[in-house]
Each structure stands twice: as C-alpha cells, then as structure tokens.
C-alpha cells in the first residue's frame, strides 16, 4: 500500500556539509543530510539512519517521502510544516521509526498529502487530533485517502489507562476529517472489538483491514453505511460465527469481497444460517477453505460441506441436574 | 488520478477471437474492480462483466456469458477481456472502467467485426 | 434483469437553464443509481453516484436525487461545456444495467 520510488539516480548529501548549511536559510532543492533524493522521482528517502527528528530542509518537489526505520519518538505540531509548504506531497511512510507519541495538528500544511503509514509504530499516545489538526467539532477535510495503522499498538506496559480501540477510534473520527477516507488498513492491533461508530462516519471507505486481530464478534458492526465497501479483510481474528443481521448487510454490499480465513468457526446450531448463506453467496473469497474448529468433534470440517443435521447446540440442562 | 490505457482498434472476421487490454496506471487509488462495457455505433452503454483483480473473481452478463472471458494480471496492472466467436453485431466501442461505481473509464477500443 | 427507462431521449436548453433527467428502475434499486457523462467522441465521465455523491472533482452544478426506483439528475445552471449524453445505470443487483441515455443540447 505505501509508496515505492521508481527512481533509479538517487543523490545522496554529504554528511560533512550538515552542520554548515543549517546554519543559514535552506536552499529550495538540497537534499537532506542522511537522505537520498531523486528531483526526478520527485522522491526522497531517509530510511534507517536512526533520524530523531523530521529534517527541516526537505526539498520542496518532494512527492513520496520515507522516513522508514528511524527513532523519530516524537512527531510534534507541525512537523511537515514548511514555508514554503510542501505542497506537493503526497505519500509519507514513517513505518517503523519508533513513533510512540503522534501530537495534534502533526499533519498539518500537508495539503496534498494522500496516503499515510505508521505501522509498525508502538503508539502508546495517538492524539485524536492528529490527522484532523484541530479541536473542532468538523475540521477542514483532509486530503488523506489512504491510512495505513497495521501493527501501531504498544506493549501492554506503555499502553496508556484507556482503551487502545477508543484512542485509535477518536483519532479517525475526530473533526469528521477522514470523510474521504478510502483505505483504512488496521491489521495486527490486538482490537478484541471495532466501536459501532466508527464505520458509520467513514463513509468513503473502500478498503478496511481488519485481519490479525482479537475479534470475537461482529454483532454491534454495521456495515451498511459503507456502500461501496469493496474489501473486508477478517482474516485471522477470533469470529465465532456471524449472525443473520451481518450476513444480510454484507450481502447487500454490491461490490464487496469479504475474507474470513482462519477464524475459529464454532459449528454448532449458532452456525446454521452462516453455513447457508456461505453456500449461496459470492462474496466471501476462499470459502471453500473455511473450517470448524470447535467443537472438538466438528474440528477440520469444512464449512460448506456441512448440512442442518451437523450443527447440533448441547441441550442446557436444567440447574438441578448440572453438575460441578 | 486513476488513468486506464487501452490497447489498439481491432478489425476481425466473424468467428474470430479478440483480445483487448487495459493498463491501469495512477495504481495507488485504483479500484479492485475492474469493469468491461460495450457501446455499438449510435447505441447506449451495456455491462459486459467484472473482475476483482486481487482474487481472479468474475461476475459476467449472461447476454455475453460462455463468449467472453475478463482476466487480469497484477503484477502488470493489467486486465483484459477476451470476446469469441465473433459475430458483426459486436461491432463496436469496448471500454475498461475502473472502480465500483466505475469511477473512471479509459478512452475506448474500437473493434469491427466484418468478412 | 433490472430495467433502467431514462427520459427524455433527447432535450435542448438554453445556457443558464435548470435541467433535470429521469430514471426509472424496473425495482427498487436501494439507492445504487449511478449517472455518467460522455461528450461526443470522448470517453465517459462518471458524475454522481450512489444517488447523490458528487465524485471527485465534479461541479457542483451536477446533482442528483431520488429513491426506491425513480431518481432525478438535475444541472442547475447549464454551461456549454455540459453539451453531452448523460447515463443513468444501476448497480444494485447483477448484471448493471444503463438507461438509454439522454442527448442534451443547446438552444
């Protein structure tokens, strides 16, 4: 999802020349200490140099912008802010540079800015304004399209008192900046569940990954703003089943493609409507691969094949006959 | 943005085969799916079918249906579709349209089908 | 498969003029009514979708309404440069379907 450079003449600075040119006004097309650039590719790359801060004299053509594999930390109010700005950029990844604290307004003067990554990122502190820029209840639109936040959770330890889902969530709901939103990728983030608000108020969404993560249940979910849903990735999260009111908000999704890969499916009577619905529809990608995994007896066995007979639920015994 | 680039105009002779194709470049907004629509001389627009690129899924007309094949090749962003036995009253303008709703279209291919 | 009755076929208005469009689905089509522009020997455009969205960097002239299987596009001001076929299409339920097309010119 994030950019690629197809530049092949790079220019790299000249470390030793550093300390002289900050000491006076940036020329408008120097490379940054540390980078390569490419005028041509309008692209500059400033990966694994253990950077702590975004440099300042980024060149003013810059379009894709890599700022991979450093110890940034910190990305300050305004940290792309320029003058002049860089009105041209338009992909920014700061994957894997050790961000844990992501302030305010760190996007703001960035007004061609499309796609964004912070994977990889233990974002212990995600300000809920960070992409809307301001308190406002509706912020300026931002021009992001593309939000790519796999793997931003922090250890458990560094986690703050609150609810990583909620922080994430506020973050993207803030302002009603994202309306334009078109991907929104959120693998690998331990979210044992999505709040019900969330895809409501994104309704551009065309792309949501939501694979790799803890949820148990869809139940609360509604899909049915996201009318031009175009991928559902579930894959490898801890689904259960899902229920007729999801089957049938999914099913009136005209373009979309679900995939549920590796989801510990619970064949039991709770299972009878998604197994039909499974056989009938085109929207689910691979399910033929699909398998139960509880109860033990049913272990293996591969959804589509089963039948009304198969999905048997244990009668609850009354209390006076339970054991301890 | 989004462009799509079509191959060339196609003269064929009935019963022939025909191949065109749609380069998709701007590539980091595009859809997953890819749409192929007919337009014969002075006509309306009619849907030919679709594919999800990422998977190889398919959805056709069933007016075209056992005639027409729609492909794709991700790793050239590259989808094509593929009309048989070709008859002169699929003589006309074939366009690729990119997304969904079918956000964007590329500039058409002509193909004239005639002995 | 769902028939799409768009009217009129044709219409001339004058530069400034209100001017609308409507479409008829053979079923309710949940709101998935798409409208696309296409200028004489050029590719086409798509305008409005999902009834009333404005795709990106579409004139705000350009908007649509309706609902359940009867649906209006409208121009509020016409400009010369609006001088094209305009195409409803539905895409609810496969296979899509288009409306015959209406040809607007200019008085």
């Known amino acids: 999802s994030s950019p690629t450079s197809s530049a092949s003449s790079f220019s790299s600075s000249a470390p030793f020349l550093a300390s002289a040119v900050s000491a006076q006004p940036p020329l408008p097309d120097q490379c940054p200490a540390l980078c390569e650039c490419s005028e041509a590719a309008r692209t500059v790359k400033c990966v694994n140099r253990n950077l702590t801060e975004v440099p300042t004299d980024l060149p003013a053509y810059v379009r894709n912008l890599f700022l991979t594999g450093n110890q940034l930390a910190v990305l300050p109010a305004g940290a792309f802010a320029r003058r002049p700005p860089l009105a041209e950029l338009a992909a920014l990844n700061l994957s894997g540079s050790r961000l844990d604290e992501v302030r305010a307004g760190a996007f703001e003067h960035l007004p061609s800015l499309r796609q964004l990554d912070l994977s990889h990122n233990p974002l212990a502190d995600l300000s809920p304004f960070a992409f809307s820029g301001s308190n406002a209840s509706v912020s300026a639109p931002s021009p992001l399209v593309e939000l790519i936040l796999n793997h931003i959770v922090p250890p458990e330890d560094e986690r703050q008192n609150r609810s990583f889902e909620g922080m994430v969530v506020a973050a993207l709901l803030a302002g009603r900046a994202l309306q334009g939103l078109r991907r929104l990728e959120l693998a690998s983030n331990h979210f044992l569940y999505l709040p019900r608000d969330v895809l409501a108020q994104l309704p551009s969404l065309r792309h949501l990954d939501l694979s790799n993560n803890s949820l148990v249940s869809l139940t609360y979910v509604s899909f049915r703003n996201l009318t031009h849903l175009e991928s559902l990735h579930l894959e490898d999260n801890a689904l259960k089943v899902l229920h007729n009111g999801t089957l049938a908000e999914l099913q009136g999704l005209p373009h979309i493609r679900v995939f549920l890969d590796n989801n510990p499916w619970v064949c039991d009577c709770h299972m009878a409507d998604m197994v039909t619905w499974l056989k009938e529809t085109e929207v689910v990608q691979g399910k033929d691969r699909l398998t139960c995994a509880y109860p033990e007896k049913m272990r293996n066995r591969v959804l589509l094949e089963l039948n009304s007979a198969d999905l048997d639920c244990d009668p609850i015994l009354p209390p006076s006959l339970q054991t301890s | 943005e989004v462009q799509l680039v079509q191959s060339g105009a196609e003269v064929k002779k009935p019963g022939a085969t025909v191949k065109i194709s749609c380069k998709v470049s701007?590539?980091?907004?595009?859809?997953?799916?890819m749409n192929w629509v007919q337009q014969a001389p002075g006509k309306g627009l009619e849907w030919i079918g679709r594919i999800y690129r990422e998977d190889g899924h398919t959805n056709y007309n069933g007016k075209f249906k056992g005639r027409v094949t729609i492909t794709a090749d991700t790793s050239t962003d590259t989808a094509y579709m593929e009309l048989s036995s070709l008859r002169s009253e699929d003589t006309a303008v074939y366009f690729c349209?990119?997304?969904?709703?079918?956000?964007?279209w590329g500039q058409g291919t002509l193909v004239t089908v005639s002995s | 498969d769902i028939q799409m009755t768009q009217s009129p076929s044709s219409l001339s208005a004058s530069v400034g003029d209100r001017v609308t469009i409507s479409c008829r689905a053979s079923q309710d089509i949940s709101n998935y009514l798409n409208w696309y522009q296409q200028k004489p020997g050029k590719t086409v455009k798509l305008l409005i979708y999902y009834t009333s969205r404005l795709h990106s960097g579409v004139p705000s002239r350009f908007s649509g309404s309706g609902s359940g299987t009867d649906y209006t596009f409208t121009i509020s001001s016409l400009q010369p440069e609006d001088i094209a076929t305009y195409f409803c299409?539905?895409?609810?339920?496969?296979?899509?379907?288009f409306g015959g097309g209406t040809k607007l010119e200019i008085k």
């Open positions: 349209a990119n997304g969904g709703a079918m956000d964007y």
């Open positions: 299409q539905q895409d609810n339920t496969l296979p899509w379907t």
């Open positions: 701007g590539y980091a907004f595009s859809s997953s799916w």
